[in-house]
């Protein structure tokens, strides 16, 4: 049994680290590796992720861990059995990969404006909280032509678009994600989709 | 009521061995690290080792280094400190204490909270 | 090994009055905000020592609150507001960042 791609890491930098590999060959991941990961801090223990199948030769670990801070350094060991196919560590402050934004909401009944909301992934107390800004990309299935990035820059997850910029009488879809510009982070996964109609007509002497 | 308490102290020559042994009460044991500390006569306190709470991470003072060995029976609640090749700088009292939350990822510290009364250890020929 | 250098090594107070004991550590040990592994001890005659202060500035359970630490990094101060007669014996600093864990010299607080 061999690693084809080793283990890399990101975190949520909050409880939660993900981390993607690739075997050799078709590989049973939950029945036959295990991924064990130490806090290189007074005291600690090993702790142990049981992988899941990602694709055939796939395999990924999500490692519970506590709230990240930037002096922790993680050492991961991958067993197969009694066998050790990889070693290595793992620094989840320089690997950072924000959660997703959610509960994105599009307000249509404010007067020429589409209003789209959503809400920080983060609580409060967490360092990412006011660090996070956003992308809000907006699409039409009516018109392929049509999909634009908003980039929000500002704390307030909120974005408003002129009615007036965007077709009437057809569909849009937007989705938001975010990154840490001070954590020097990766982009999140997108939000899901939400769907709204565009019914906003002009004024008849604007037209 | 949360508890430490030592036994096998006494009187050895140099180069003996003698076996402490630290019983807990009051706690979840193998949820936390455990640490001995020692005082010499007139003298402040010396760090001697530490363990993790499932007892897979010890830890020593390098004046014990190769001569004591730290140990544990969570089923017994008990704290152990083998200690071979005894010198006369080991004649001190001898105090177990609890050390942090090691169950969790980083482990939580919440200080050396509670300490036993102490075992008196004598080397002298 | 992380070397703790306490100040004063005898500290001779009138009862009422406060009380200030300082403790340097050779590097830093702050561990992320707000969580500096450093502990305050006090030891009577013919007792075990007990925890007063931990993480630097946390009141361990049942301790008065007369007793208060602060600093960060590798300056550290434990306060006594008010002494008392009670309050005598020697005080350790220890540092718990990394085995192996060191102590203070030790500060004989005594009643005038």
């Known amino acids: 049994m061999k690693v084809l791609q080793e283990p890399a890491c990101v975190s949520d930098y909050m409880s939660i680290s993900t981390c993607e590999w690739k075997m050799g060959g078709p590989t049973n991941c939950s029945a036959e590796l295990r991924l064990l990961y130490q806090l290189v801090f007074q005291s600690s223990e090993t702790h142990t992720c049981v992988p899941e199948n990602n694709g055939g030769v796939g395999c990924v670990c999500h490692l519970l861990m506590d709230d990240v801070v930037s002096m922790d350094n993680y050492t991961l060991d991958l067993w197969a059995g009694q066998q050790l196919l990889w070693k290595g560590s793992f620094k989840p402050s320089e690997h950072v990969k924000p959660r997703a934004p959610g509960n994105l909401t599009v307000h249509t009944n404010v007067s020429d404006t589409v209003l789209l909301t959503w809400s920080n992934p983060y609580p409060p107390d967490n360092y990412l909280y006011n660090d996070l800004t956003y992308a809000v990309n907006i699409w039409s299935e009516n018109d392929p032509a049509y999909s634009r990035i908003h980039n929000v820059t500002y704390l307030k997850p909120t974005l408003r678009i002129p009615a007036s910029t965007l077709k009437s009488g057809i569909s849009y879809r937007a989705r938001v994600r975010a990154w840490a510009q001070h954590y020097n982070t990766t982009w999140s996964e997108w939000s899901p989709s939400t769907k709204w109609y565009n019914s906003y007509r002009e004024p008849f002497e604007q037209r | 009521e949360v508890q430490l308490v030592e036994s096998g102290g006494g009187l050895e020559q140099p180069g003996g061995s003698l076996r402490l042994s630290c019983a807990g009460s009051?706690?979840?044991?193998?949820?936390?690290?455990m640490t001995w500390v020692r005082q010499a006569p007139g003298k402040g306190l010396e760090w001697v080792s530490s363990?993790?709470?499932?007892?897979?991470?010890?830890y020593y003072a390098d004046s014990v280094k190769g001569r004591f060995t730290i140990s544990r029976d969570n089923s017994k609640n008990t704290l152990y400190l083998q200690m071979n090749s005894l010198r006369a700088e080991d004649t001190a009292v001898y105090y177990c204490?609890?050390?942090?939350?090691?169950?969790?990822?980083?482990?939580?510290?919440?200080?050396?909270?509670?300490w036993g009364q102490g075992t008196t250890v004598t080397v002298s020929s | 090994d992380i070397v703790m250098t306490q100040s004063p090594l005898s500290l001779p107070v009138t009862p009422g009055e406060p009380a200030s004991i300082s403790c340097r550590s050779s590097q830093s040990l702050l561990y992320s905000i707000g969580y500096n592994y450093v502990d305050w001890y006090l030891q009577k005659s013919g007792q075990s020592p007990q925890l007063l202060i931990y993480l630097g500035n946390k009141r361990a359970s049942g301790v008065p609150d007369r007793f208060s630490g602060s600093g960060s990094g590798t300056d550290f101060t434990l306060k006594i507001s008010r002494v008392e007669a009670e309050d005598v014996g020697f005080y350790y600093c220890?540092?718990?960042?990394?085995?192996?864990?060191?102590f203070g010299q030790g500060t004989k607080l005594e009643i005038k």
């Open positions: 220890m540092q718990a960042l990394t085995t192996p864990y060191t």
């Open positions: 204490a609890k050390d942090r939350l090691s169950i969790t990822v980083r482990p939580r510290y919440y200080g050396l909270d509670v």
């Open positions: 009051g706690f979840t044991f193998r949820d936390f690290a």
């Open positions: 363990i993790s709470g499932s007892g897979s991470s010890t």
